[in-house]
């Protein structure tokens, strides 16, 4: 039986991507310059290490975490890298234009690269919900819209609520999750007969997904502490994140076994739940005063993640067309919300203890921030979904969802790849 390949992206992708890259190069040429004032080379190296951790998380961690599909593992890893590379470039420019452009030029520092990598990470989280159903040309659109939406969200939140870099970036979990879910909702859903096997996981790709999860697990403390201002804040953030992810691993493996009738451990549950603690403490990682509190949060997050992985995929598959192994969307949406709620609860508990009259106002501000993040994520996600449905992108045919052969040249065209 001959393979029904989709409409070629040969005419669409190179022209679109290279034109965009040329435009970015021109923007960098006219509007940016490096920060030339660094005197201390040792300090530069130390500062770069945080950025390096974030890049490892994005390229290897999220790249491999999404690679568990039987016939879509190459595309998952490589498309992630493509989106990261493009997203970082656009995020550096966008953040510069939004925050420092009035001074004439955008100054590129190690911090701006750090910030841009985190913004691009948002796309890598969202895309888990649509990988396998879109081509690279569509992913370029998704990168541009999402990075722009996140950048503007952060700017709006900062200006209205006077929040710092860390606080406004920690909405990334909720934002990315709801953005991805709303894009997935817009895309064609039903998988035609005969393609069900492609969105199943396979042993070797699942192992690489576990490798991705391990890299994320190792570097999550760097992510949560990357934008904090002082060593004491960063230290607390690193410690608390570490305790939380450590407990969520134990909870994930135990909870996964508990959730199975025969006591078996699910790979999918473990992939997602090991990260649960890091997401849940993200917003308040530097505010948590004691290890036990971070550990309790890790435990709760692990349980929620395993519970979500057990009961939500059916719903997500029916309503949004998201395959069972694409766990990041609903996982991060739940855990991101949990993290925001934890922040508000800490605020309330401590302010009540101190007898501060500003409590209602501060809680209102926090709820306002969260609501704004969700609303902008949903709106921009729906806009992106509508854009991705346009015929010009030559989207893969539904029969060719989750298929590496559509995009990659293999020396052997074995159908069972």
């Amino acid at each position: 039986m001959s393979s029904k390949y989709p409409r070629s992206v040969r005419r669409c992708l190179p022209l679109w991507a290279l034109t965009l890259e040329a435009a970015l190069i021109l923007l960098f040429y006219f509007f940016t310059h490096y920060d030339a004032s660094l005197e201390d080379q040792k300090g530069l190296v130390a500062s770069y290490q945080v950025g390096q951790d974030l890049t490892v998380m994005a390229a290897i961690g999220l790249g491999f975490l999404t690679s568990s599909f039987r016939r879509h593992s190459w595309s998952s890893v490589a498309f992630n890298l493509f989106m990261l590379a493009l997203g970082v470039q656009w995020a550096i420019l966008l953040d510069g234009f939004l925050s420092q452009f009035p001074s004439g030029k955008v100054v590129i520092t190690l911090f701006s690269i750090r910030l841009a990598t985190m913004s691009a990470l948002s796309v890598l989280i969202s895309v888990d919900a649509v990988l396998g159903k879109v081509n690279l040309a569509q992913l370029v659109v998704m990168v541009l819209v999402e990075v722009t939406a996140l950048g503007n969200l952060r700017m709006v939140i900062s200006n209205i609520f006077n929040t710092d870099y860390h606080m406004n970036m920690m909405h990334i979990y909720v934002f990315a999750a709801y953005f991805g879910l709303s894009v997935a909702w817009c895309l064609p859903k039903p998988l035609p007969e005969g393609t069900e096997d492609k969105d199943q996981t396979a042993t070797i790709p699942s192992l690489s997904a576990m490798l991705g999860a391990l890299f994320l697990w190792m570097f999550w403390p760097s992510f949560n502490s990357a934008l904090l201002r002082s060593p004491i804040e960063r230290k607390n953030a690193v410690f608390n994140t570490y305790y939380a992810v450590a407990v969520s691993v134990v909870t994930a493996i135990s909870g996964s076994s508990l959730a199975h009738p025969q006591g078996k451990i699910s790979k999918t549950y473990v992939h997602s739940a090991v990260l649960a603690g890091g997401v849940a403490v993200g917003t308040s990682c530097h505010l948590i005063p004691s290890p036990w509190l971070a550990m309790v949060l890790g435990l709760v997050a692990g349980l929620i993640s395993v519970g979500g992985a057990k009961y939500l995929p059916g719903c997500c598959n029916r309503v949004l067309g998201i395959p069972h192994s694409s766990i990041m969307g609903y996982n991060f949406s739940l855990l991101g919300l949990l993290g925001e709620i934890i922040y508000i609860v800490l605020l309330v508990l401590d302010t009540v203890g101190a007898g501060n009259g500003m409590i209602g106002f501060q809680v209102l501000l926090s709820i306002g921030e969260l609501s704004l993040a969700i609303v902008i994520a949903l709106m921009s996600g729906l806009l992106t979904g509508l854009l991705l449905n346009l015929k010009i992108w030559k989207a893969p045919h539904e029969a060719k969802y989750f298929d590496d052969q559509v995009f990659w040249k293999f020396p052997h065209l074995a159908v069972g790849f």
Epitope: D40, S99, T163, R229, P289
Partner: antibody, heavy 129, light 109 residues
Amino acid sequence: QVQLVESGGGVVQPGRSLRLSCAASGFTFSSYGMHWVRQAPGKGLEWVAVIWYDGSNKYYADSVKGRFTISRDNSKNTLYLQMNSLRAEDTAVYYCARDMVTMVRGAYRNYYYYGMDVWGKGTTVTVSS
Amino acid sequence: EIVMTQSPATLSVSPGERATLSCRASQSVSSNLAWYQQKPGQAPRLLIYGASTRATGIPARFSGSGSGTEFTLTISSLQSEDFAVYYCQQYNNWPTLYTFGQGTKLEIK
């Protein structure tokens, strides 16, 4: 003891450049953000710039943005302010100050407060033709 | 940009009496406010941070209060060494800016 000593001030013509230095001693310089603050003759204090402890982030007052550059060398325990395109209104005593971040542990959460807790004696910059 | 307004510009108080200095922000700065004391020919000295926490070595007669847009520095019983210029200063997260008030000169009555 904890000390900050500014140097590099002087008389300079408008449009020219000057580089101020601030030598720190008595504390772990690489663990603190640092500020430059100025005070024009007979006037109040005006914040100029801040740099994070690791040099990764810098911010400037609108009045000096694009003309002044703050930097630091943690290996030499020194803070710098490169001032270009100087104007008459830049005439002031320039102080460097340490950025204090204090953590107050509440029952359920930490609070972080900021202030400039250690100041140098200042160095005078006069921009005049 | 947040503007800090201090009042009064000059305050005349007798030694031993209480002095109350006010600082108003044009928009909420939460508790991101500090108070400084500056004597002629000297560098400023941090008195209060976080709107109400005394800095190390600052006598108990200095106290700060307020949150949001209205802040107060109170000196309960003025000593001769307290006569100086006092500045309030806010820290804004975004854009990252530090703004000082124009100062209140505390003089002997």
